[in-house]
Interface confidence: low
């Protein structure tokens, strides 16, 4: 018995087609993705093949003006229109709190939304009960397939799930649910979830009874053969993991931003064992037409967005590199721009001894969600910035000891190389890392811009000195694992809205050209 699994993950509000780098579409003839194009391909495959499941592995929420304005209603509406069969909760589904998940998505979705390792407690337990499920048994042709969901247990560090949701270890939570499906004689089980490729592989290895893992969160691109676009494969598609009980378990992900539609064909024997698996992500390029009815619906919903944020704020004459491939690995000029804007927004020359009360900025690279292409006449709009900074946070002022900052920079690279969001972009700081050293001892040089000086210059960080730092409220609250900031900050003053800070700076500067200039180095 053959099953076709179509899958998306980390779509991040890319309802409309995008440029090749998943930023705003500039030249429509070269644009990709979007739900109208996705629908065309899905329908094509549904017409051609008998047993098709369309699955999403989480993080539909957050990323463009669509989410800024519609707050998840757009996700429910268009996923319903595409007739998704199931979705796993991603960490970003909690960005507007639990209510921002329940009302627009959980209550409106016409498909099951899954996570086995999220447990509600307190008053939320009854409110949310049944609105998401640990698993769902789906009829597919003459067979049934069990889909069991999972979500990154780091979600409380990455989003806003509140205090009444407990995120359990994925493997520990998944096993009993898979066992339950087995007792119901469901012998074909897909783990659909959002914890990253490393966890996906662990689930394939450790959870007995899981036949296929469909993942997300790490934006992993897998491909067999010659890749069709810029993404470099992290491995073959599907990636085969040998489970502890000797089975070959296919693991898949489909990059991100709706650029690809994952396509996996699985052959099962009569006992539900995987006999074979093959496929590849399908690049949703402009050769695939956008479905007219979905496109018309997009255009109808688009009207509200057009009134929101299309005015030009200023211009860039350089590419603003906000890609995760850059900002989560090295200094990126988008990070520099944002940090410069954050410092500029906090210029308070109140004392002759100090050129300013604060000189330093840190910014988690994972908070930078999109690049901006300069080839659109250099125009920067609020809409562009909303894709870069979609979280609606604030840039806050804190006071920290030097020792806390040192811990923060060690945390920045404690698991370097996994495309995790805690890698810090900086302003008013020069840092040098040695990645050959063990985690926790990788910062070999940390110089900070003086404030009590007439000519600003960089001096070594002093462990016992108290420094003022501008940072996102997300970091001040211990997000991305920066618990030391939350625990050790001496003062915290809430600041201005993030997009507003950057837009004000761009409007003030009129033309910007941020460079990569050696703020972050590796020895």
């Amino acid at each position: 018995w053959e099953l076709t699994i179509l899958h998306t993950n980390d779509v991040h509000s890319r309802l409309e087609q995008t440029s090749e780098d998943s930023s705003k579409c500039v030249n429509a003839s070269r644009c990709m993705g979007g739900v109208a194009r996705l629908f065309t391909k899905v329908q094509q495959i549904r017409r051609a093949e008998p047993n098709v499941l369309l699955l999403d592995a989480g993080d539909q929420y957050q990323g463009t003006i669509w989410f800024t304005v519609y707050k998840g209603a757009e996700v429910a509406h268009f996923m319903n229109a595409l007739r998704y069969d199931a979705m796993a909760l991603g960490n970003h589904e909690f960005d507007n709190g639990v209510e921002g998940l329940i009302e627009p998505l959980l209550k409106e979705a016409k498909f099951p939304i899954l996570s086995a390792n999220i447990k509600a407690k307190g008053p939320l337990a009854s409110q949310i009960s049944g609105l998401y499920l640990p698993y769902k048994v789906l009829p597919v042709g003459d067979e049934v397939v069990g889909i069991v969901g999972y979500t990154s247990k780091e979600t409380p560090f990455l989003s806003n799930p509140g205090t009444n949701l407990v995120f359990e270890d994925e493997i520990t939570a998944l096993q009993p649910e898979v066992d339950k499906l087995k007792t119901l004689n469901v012998n074909k089980i897909i783990a659909l979830g959002h914890s990253g490729f490393e966890m996906d592989k662990l689930i394939a290895q450790k959870v007995r009874g899981v036949d296929v893992v469909v993942g997300g969160h790490s934006n992993t691109f897998l491909y067999t053969g010659n890749p069709p676009s810029k993404e470099v494969p992290a491995g073959k598609y599907p990636f085969i993991v040998t489970s502890d009980d000797g089975r070959k378990v296919p693991v898949v992900q489909a990059y991100a931003f709706g650029k690809y539609l994952g396509y996996l064909k699985i052959e099962f024997d009569e006992r539900g064992n995987v006999i074979s698996s093959h496929g590849n992500p399908i690049l949703l390029n402009s050769s695939i037409p956008e479905d007219p009815s979905i496109k018309a619906d997009i255009n109808k919903w688009r009207i509200k967005l057009d009134n929101y944020s299309t005015q030009e704020l200023g211009k860039t004459i350089v590419y603003l590199d906000g890609s995760s491939q850059s900002c989560r690995f090295r200094e990126c000029n988008m990070g520099n721009l944002i940090c410069d804007a954050m410092i500029n927004n906090n210029l308070r020359h109140t004392d002759e001894m100090f050129w300013n009360h604060v000189s330093m900025c840190i910014l988690n690279g994972g908070g930078i969600r999109s690049p901006i292409d300069e080839r659109n006449n250099g125009t920067i709009t609020w809409e562009n910035l909303a894709a870069v900074l979609p979280f609606g946070g604030t840039f806050d002022l804190v006071q920290l000891k030097g020792s806390t900052l040192k811990k923060a920079f060690e945390h920045s690279v404690h698991r370097y190389g996994q495309s995790t969001g805690e890698f810090l972009q900086v302003g008013g700081i020069h840092v040098v890392y040695d990645l050959s050293r063990k985690p926790g001892d990788r910062v070999v040089k940390l110089d900070v811009l003086c404030t009590k000086c007439r000519v600003p210059s960089y001096d070594p960080l002093k462990m016992d000195e108290v420094y003022k730092v501008i940072l996102p409220n997300f970091l001040a609250n211990g997000g991305d694992g920066f618990q030391m900031i939350k625990d050790e900050l001496l003062r915290h003053d809430s600041g201005d809205q993030d997009i507003n800070v950057v837009s004000t700076y761009i409007s003030k500067m009129k033309v910007i050209y941020p460079a990569v200039e050696g703020r972050i180095k590796f020895s």
Epitope: K107, L131, V144
Partner: antibody, heavy 121, light 107 residues
């Protein structure tokens, strides 16, 4: 305690429509499914369809498709079943029944007392 | 649709008897079977779900078993209040279907 309180008996003429209500209390209305099951006098049980008030999802028995509409008003925790083009063979007791679809509890755990619908000219 | 064939359609037994009612599905329903008890003029009451799990408050004399297409309800020692009609139901696939019922009468 969980209660499903149904509307009163109805007498309808052939060709007419009937709308039966089912008011839920004692639990979170949007957290469970509600099925509608009917039983003609001296006969067995027949599943008509179900609604998940949390999402508005409806699934109908093909036999009733086109004639049955199931809706829910979450603000008053009430589900409705409307059956149109009534004929004499629709004379039955109509039950709403709660379905706990979270986990493996495959069954209707609470039932309304039933609404008798008589179709007669 | 999945047919649920219940047998017997009626059964006479005495208090203290052990009674078995069977239900055969027209296809594998993966233990997604519930059993209900109904008394005249009343709504059905859930006894067992997922073939063998007793619903809360249901006496231990009621038990269920089965897998695939064949399912059984057993009452180990009939009590006076057990005389009623019993229905099986598959909750595996829509439309959910019921057996024709077994009327359990006093001998």
């Amino acid at each position: 305690q969980v209660q499903l309180v149904q509307s009163g008996a109805e007498v309808k003429k052939p060709g007419a429509s009937v709308k039966v209500s089912c008011k839920a209390s004692g639990y979170t209305f949007t957290s469970y499914g509600l099925s509608w099951v009917r039983q003609a006098t001296g006969q067995g049980l027949e599943w008509m369809g179900e609604i998940y008030p949390g999402s508005g999802n409806t699934y109908y028995n093909e036999k009733f498709k086109g004639r049955v509409t199931m809706t829910a008003n979450t603000s008053i925790s009430t589900a409705y079943m409307e059956l149109s083009s009534l004929r004499s063979e629709d004379t039955a007791v109509y039950y709403c029944a709660r379905y706990d679809y979270l986990g493996s509890s495959y069954g209707f755990d609470y039932w309304g007392a039933g609404t008798t619908v008589t179709v007669s000219s | 649709d999945i047919q649920m064939t219940q047998s017997p359609s009626s059964l006479s037994a005495s208090v203290g008897d052990r009674v078995t009612i069977t239900c055969k599905a027209s296809q594998d329903v993966s233990t997604a079977v519930a059993w209900y008890q109904q008394k005249p003029g009343k709504a059905p009451k859930l006894l067992l779900y997922s073939a063998s799990y007793r619903y809360s408050g249901v006496p231990s004399r009621f038990s269920g078993s089965g897998s695939g297409t064949d399912y059984t309800l057993t009452i180990s020692s009939l009590q006076p209040e057990d005389f009623a009609t019993y229905y099986c139901q598959q909750h595996y696939n829509t439309p959910y279907t019921f057996g024709g019922g077994t009327k359990l009468e006093i001998k």
